[in-house]
């Protein structure tokens, strides 16, 4: 059974490939069963992740879960790296998995890898 | 409660193609990897690959890469894997499953009935 | 790949007996998050494969107590304390750790 413990849906060693200059959505699927918790992201740096603190971030309702998004408008080529998302709830910190934003640079856009081929990296 | 339906069987001749098919309900598959597995008759497991379906990345073992196509319709909850070239060797039973690694040790994995695929002419 | 070998190819045990399967892997499967993804699976006769463990000592819901896994880096071990006839079937160890994910070559469970 699922418990009402405060769950981050991020998959483990997940991929986005993305273009440089285009708007992006990074999503960090929450369930929660009451209260909604406090949401932040993190890029991580090393074995650091660290807090990114003044960035554009909304959340999105929907039936059964919610999404904390953080917002790149537009996408940079140093916004290349992993993010986590982490959740504080009754005083525990839930921490995701990272998830991984390969950035093509606009200039090389024509040499664009395919997804699979990002996929394998 | 999740469950993962496969068609039951599936005859084809040598040199041609087959797509199985895998549907989910009971869990959005978005929110989830999906894997397929070979069980040759009598032997053992062999991980063919798996998708994201929120994205469309894939990753396969390298033996079966060329010869498997893994896709998602989030829409209808299915994954699919499309099996080219068929020979003998093809013959097997083909297991999807679904895999989540989440946060707060919620970790679960579930398993098709599998396609028994024949390959004879 | 990483190679993924279990010992013994079948094990015959009577009823109400232990029985323990190992299961060692050609390189750690300690990965970066300090997690050990490490399954262990039981294909009964006829049906799919059905996860019993997960992260190499976590027991999935349903799963009954008389199961324990452990062991670490490369090195693990599914014991059975008192084995019922329900357990009958092929045992396999899976790790999720490296690309691509792999199996063992399963061991085999009888009822003597």
């Known amino acids: 059974k699922e418990s009402c413990d405060v769950q981050l849906y991020i998959k483990r060693q997940s991929e986005h490939s993305i273009l440089a200059g285009d708007p992006f959505e990074l999503e960090c699927p929450v369930k929660y069963c009451a209260n909604r918790p406090h949401v932040t992201w993190c890029k991580l740096n090393g074995t650091t992740c660290v807090k990114l603190e003044d960035r554009q971030t909304s959340w999105k309702e929907e039936k059964n879960i919610s999404f904390f998004i953080l917002h790149f408008e537009p996408v940079l080529p140093n916004d290349n790296g992993s993010y986590r998302c982490s959740a504080n709830f009754q005083s525990n910190l839930i921490e995701s998995h990272s998830t991984t934003l390969y950035v093509t640079d606009v200039k090389s856009a024509s040499e664009r890898p395919s997804k699979d081929e990002m996929a394998s990296r | 409660e999740v469950q993962l339906q496969q068609s039951v069987a599936e005859l084809v001749r040598p040199g041609a193609s087959v797509k199985l098919s895998c549907t989910a309900s009971g869990f959005n598959i978005k929110n989830t990897y999906m894997h397929w597995v070979k069980q040759r008759p009598e032997q053992g497991l062999e991980w063919i690959g798996r998708?994201?379906?929120?994205?469309?990345?894939?990753k396969y073992a390298p033996k079966f890469q060329g010869k498997a196509t893994i896709t998602a319709d989030t829409s209808s909850n299915t994954a699919y894997l499309q099996l080219s070239s068929l020979t003998s060797e093809d013959t097997a039973i083909y297991y999807c499953?679904?895999?989540?690694?989440?946060?707060?040790?919620?970790?679960?994995?579930?398993w098709g009935q599998g396609t028994t695929l024949t390959v004879s002419s | 790949d990483v190679v993924m070998t279990q010992t013994p190819l079948t094990l015959s045990v009577t009823i109400g007996q232990p029985a323990s399967i190992s299961c060692k892997s050609s390189q750690s499967l300690l990965d970066s998050d300090g997690k050990t993804y490490l399954n262990w699976l039981l294909q009964r006769p006829g049906q799919s494969p059905k996860r019993l463990i997960y992260l190499v000592s976590k027991l999935d819901s349903g799963v009954p107590d008389r199961f324990t896994g452990s062991g670490s880096g490369t090195d693990f071990t599914l014991k059975i304390s008192r084995v019922e006839a329900e357990d009958l079937g092929v045992y396999y160890c899976?790790?999720?750790?490296?690309?691509?994910?792999?199996f063992g070559g399963g061991t085999k469970l009888e009822i003597k």
């Open positions: 499953a679904l895999t989540y690694y989440g946060s707060s040790q919620y970790y679960f994995d579930y």
């Open positions: 998708i994201d379906p929120a994205n469309g990345n894939t």
């Open positions: 899976w790790q999720g750790t490296h690309f691509p994910q792999t």
